[in-house]
């Protein structure tokens, strides 16, 4: 807090310029008109003020706009944005994608800060849904953004926005998130032909049900092992040996290296050893010949 003192004669700022770096903090407080500052915020971003001087300027804006800054000021905050608290940002109404981009640019190269998280939350809530342009912007700055959302939040993503998603944007998504995203991706890419469809849908397959995996196995997709290992265990278990062989194509040989890891391990336990032997990979742990497999869950459902 800077003490309230009168501005010395001849020091009243007529514009925001480099001469202000020579003002002491109390002089900035006394001699810079807050309304002038608000209209010339873009200039602050070109002047090498110290952090302490920026604190004074922020204080002046806070006094001028106790209910929250207007978007015309927010768009030009630059570094001053990083001095805002989440509480400050919750008072804002940010509707322009240009404003969002300008503020994300300030934080570029850093982790998502609480300020940025609050800003994004305010922006998305204001828009009502995560439209394609917003998602494009957010994932460009923060590839992990999508996976930071809850399944409930992801449900507001329209299928058309899925086109903006890159494989690396899904790297940290868990199965619950992929369960929400997969049906949207399936809808978004439904008009593509077989091989093109598979390229686009591949990153989302961690949310695919058994019937979709069975359908893919009929299309010579040659799924790689990394993708297979990310599939839902409950979706993989009902697949037959023949279906997995078709699904993986030449990559089927990789099953041997993964036989102790889920979902391969659990899938092996559900297959007849005879069928596994047809792969010629030496996979062990299948159901021995002559054993009858009862699906108790099915039996319970019937009773």
């Amino acid at each position: 807090e800077v003490e309230k003192t009168a501005c010395p004669s001849g020091k009243k700022a007529r514009e925001i310029d480099e001469s202000l770096i020579f003002y002491k903090k109390w002089e900035l407080e006394a001699c810079v008109d807050a309304a002038l500052l608000a209209t010339q915020m873009d200039r602050v971003n070109a002047i090498p003020f110290t952090y302490e001087q920026l604190d004074v300027l922020k204080h002046k804006l806070d006094e001028l706009y106790p209910q929250g800054y207007p978007e015309s000021v927010i768009q030009h905050l630059g570094y001053l944005f990083l001095k805002m608290s989440p509480e400050d940002i919750r008072k804002w109404n940010v509707t322009s994608l240009e404003t969002l981009k300008a503020l994300l640019e300030v934080n570029k190269g850093h982790e998502m800060s609480p300020q940025v998280a609050t800003l994004i939350d305010r922006f998305v809530k204001g828009r009502g849904q995560l439209d394609k342009d917003t998602l494009d912007t957010l994932t460009a700055f923060y590839p992990g953004y999508l996976c930071s959302l809850s399944p409930e939040e992801l449900s507001s993503v329209p299928p058309s926005s899925i086109w903006a998603v890159r494989p690396q944007d899904l790297d940290t998504c868990d199965p619950r998130q992929l369960d929400v995203l997969y049906p949207k991706a399936r809808l978004a890419f439904q008009n593509m032909n077989g091989s093109e469809y598979f390229v686009k849908i591949q990153s989302f397959l961690g949310g695919a049900p058994t019937e979709d995996l069975k359908a893919l196995s009929q299309q010579n997709v040659s799924m790689d092992l990394a993708t297979f290992m990310k599939l839902r265990t409950d979706a993989v278990l009902p697949l037959t040996v023949a279906e997995v062989q078709k699904l993986l194509g030449p990559h089927v040989e990789g099953l041997k290296a993964e036989e102790r890891h889920r979902p391969v391990r659990d899938w092996i336990l559900r297959q007849r050893q005879d069928d596994l032997d047809t792969l010629g990979l030496g996979l062990q742990g299948g159901i021995p010949n002559g054993y009858l497999v009862l699906d108790l869950s099915m039996q319970e459902a019937l009773s």
Epitope: E18, V44, N45, A46, I47, P48, F49, T50, Y51, L54, L77, G78, Y79, L80, A102, E105, V106, K108
Partner: nanobody, 115 residues
Framework: LQLVESGGGLVQPGGSLRLSCAAS????????IGWFRQAPGKEREGVSS????????NYADSVKGRFTVSRDNAKHTVYLQMNSLKPEDTAVYYC??????????MGQGTSVTVS
């Protein structure tokens, strides 16, 4: 973003020093730079500034005619040439940079003693 100042030291009244400000991990070329100083027990004060192109410079009244700010973008360095030094110039000198989107960088300072 970190700036590194150097060139400080002990000098007699009337003597000269040249301070340097360089960037660590990025390039200063598109950064406007301000030089500040802080004497013991006093508020930090602005000394001079230079635009990113070097075409515009400003000075505090107390150093006008004695200090000169310049930049060598080929060496990614900004200089503060201090002549006719006085005991009241004794302080820790800092450089502050501002780049695209108002991104800031500041150094740890270099100490100047005029005695």
């Amino acid at each position: 973003l970190q700036l590194v100042e150097s060139g400080g030291g002990l000098v007699q009244p009337g003597g000269s020093l040249r301070l340097s400000c360089a960037a660590s991990g990025f390039t200063l070329d598109n950064y406007a730079i301000g030089w500040f100083r802080q004497a013991p027990g006093k508020e930090r004060e602005g000394v001079s500034s230079i635009s990113s192109s070097g075409g515009s410079t400003n000075y505090a009244d107390s150093v006008k005619g004695r200090f000169t700010v310049s930049r060598d973008n080929a060496k990614h360095t900004v200089y503060l040439q201090m002549n006719s030094l006085k005991p009241e110039d004794t302080a820790v000198y800092y450089c502050v940079g501002v780049g695209d989107y108002g991104r800031r960088a500041m150094g740890q300072g270099t100490s100047v003693t005029v005695s």
